[in-house]
Interface confidence: low
């Protein structure tokens, strides 16, 4: 009696169980009563990552430099190419189809966490006693200058965007 279900790594066709092609290979012809399934390796720029009965291999992903992408891991006959973003960019989405520039933290904000290839810059407001006067993707909030340690006095208070201004102490004679 012809089978109605097949074992793992097999598929049912014409009332018989044929072996699936292994990862990295595509189906050329189904098995028959007398012949095994015929499979062929994927070409250099293609892959198949599962046991399959596909007649075409999938094209490796193209890491398009015009989208800010570069190859992180070259594809094989069994795996797709993995793209990552160029320096200064991070992936738009999990699939990393394109990249966007890291955002800069504006004056008054410092970098809490530097961006990576997959996550954007995280900024934080500069707390009292700290400032940032630049728009930067790397700089943290910097502490106000300590006038006392320089034997000077505060002439102008600092803000979250500006450092304190120190000046000489008025000496009483």
């Amino acid at each position: 009696e012809p089978p109605t279900a097949c074992r793992e790594k097999q598929y049912l066709i014409n009332s018989q169980c044929c072996s699936l092609c292994q990862p990295g290979q595509k189906l050329v012809s189904d098995c028959t009563e007398f012949t095994e399934t015929e499979c062929l390796p994927c070409s250099e720029s293609e892959f198949l990552d599962t046991w399959n009965r596909e007649t075409r291999c999938h094209q490796h992903k193209y890491c398009d430099p015009n989208l800010g992408l570069r190859v992180q891991q070259k594809g094989t006959s069994e795996t797709d190419t993995i793209c990552t973003c160029e320096e200064g960019l991070h992936c738009m989405s999990e699939s990393c189809e394109s990249c966007v520039p890291h955002r800069s933290c504006l004056p008054g904000f410092g970098v809490k966490q530097i961006a990576t290839g997959v996550s954007d810059t995280i900024c934080e407001p500069c707390p009292v006693g700290f400032f940032s006067n630049v728009s930067s993707a790397f700089e943290k909030c910097r502490p106000w200058t300590s006038c006392e340690t320089k034997d000077l006095v505060v002439q102008q208070a600092g803000t979250n965007k500006t450092d304190v201004v120190c000046g000489p102490q008025d000496r009483q004679r």
């Epitope: 398009d64 430099p65 015009n66 160029e86 738009m92 189809e97 966007v100 520039p101």
Partner: antibody, heavy 120, light 107 residues
Framework: QVQLVQSGAEVKKPGASVKVSCKAS????????VNWVRQAPGQRLEWMGL????????TYNQKFKGRVTLTIDKSASTAYMELSSLRSEDTAVYYC?????????????WGQGTLVTVSS | EIVMTQSPATLSVSPGERATLSCKAS??????VAWYQQKPGQAPRLLIY???DRRTGIPARFSGSGSGTEFTLTISSLQSEDFAVYYC?????????FGQGTKVEIK
């Protein structure tokens, strides 16, 4: 509102070159690719190529066989398209159009167009 | 190069009616198709990208669908300002290629 402002109309003789400029107002080109598209009278739109301001990388439509050169001046937020060895069939409106990386090559902002007439 | 073929060449529709425009790619372009509207003397305007994502500010009456080789732009209820030429673009592979356009005219 993002605006791309292109240079004015040009009349050129066959064999000459033309250089069209495209200035971005409100934003710099960072995070965008700049495409160039042309449209001959009554014809479909035709993509000529693009430049990535981040790294200066260019990709051209092979149809133009080295006749087109795309450049960018980031400090002036201006992109340029130069087409050489002009012939009468190059008479067209030339557009610059930008694509944000999150919409790969789906050109979302367009210049007003520059009419280039090639006539002897 | 990938050839994009639009149909019909001209579509005559009455205001308030539905318009369905078709675009076929000569090979698989996945969902990398954009739709543009162009009026005489104006630059094209992006309506839809990635086959079905409506650009910010585009009215909800415009919708896109499809994947692979067959794509559709639907305008659910035509307004007077929608009469124009519509182009599809594949942004899957170089060179990027446009369809020849569909002119939507008043019936």
């Amino acid at each position: 509102q993002v605006q791309l402002v292109q240079s004015g109309a040009e009349v050129k003789k066959p064999g000459a070159s033309v250089k069209v400029s495209c200035k971005a107002s409100v934003y710099s080109f960072t995070g965008y690719t700049v495409n160039w598209v042309r449209q001959a009278p009554g014809q479909r739109l035709e993509w000529m190529g693009l430049i990535n301001p981040l790294n200066g990388g260019t990709t051209y439509n092979q149809k133009f066989k080295g006749r087109v050169t795309l450049t960018i001046d980031k400090s002036a937020s201006t992109a340029y398209m130069e087409l050489s060895s002009l012939r009468s069939e190059d008479t067209a409106v030339y557009y610059c159009a930008s694509s944000y990386y999150s919409t790969p090559y789906a050109m979302d902002y367009w210049g007003q167009g520059t009419l280039v007439t090639v006539s002897s | 190069e990938i050839v994009m073929t639009q149909s019909p060449a001209t579509l005559s529709v009455s205001p308030g009616e539905r318009a369905t425009l078709s675009c076929k790619a000569s090979q698989n372009v996945h969902t990398r198709v954009a739709w543009y509207q162009q009026k005489p003397g104006q630059a094209p305007r992006l309506l839809i990208y990635l086959a079905s994502d409506r650009r910010t500010g585009i009215p909800a009456r415009f919708s896109g669908s499809g994947s692979g080789t067959e794509f559709t732009l639907t305008i659910s209820s035509l307004q007077s300002e929608d009469f124009a030429v519509y182009y599809c673009l594949q942004h899957w592979n170089y060179p990027l290629t446009f369809g020849q356009g569909t002119k939507v005219e008043i019936k």
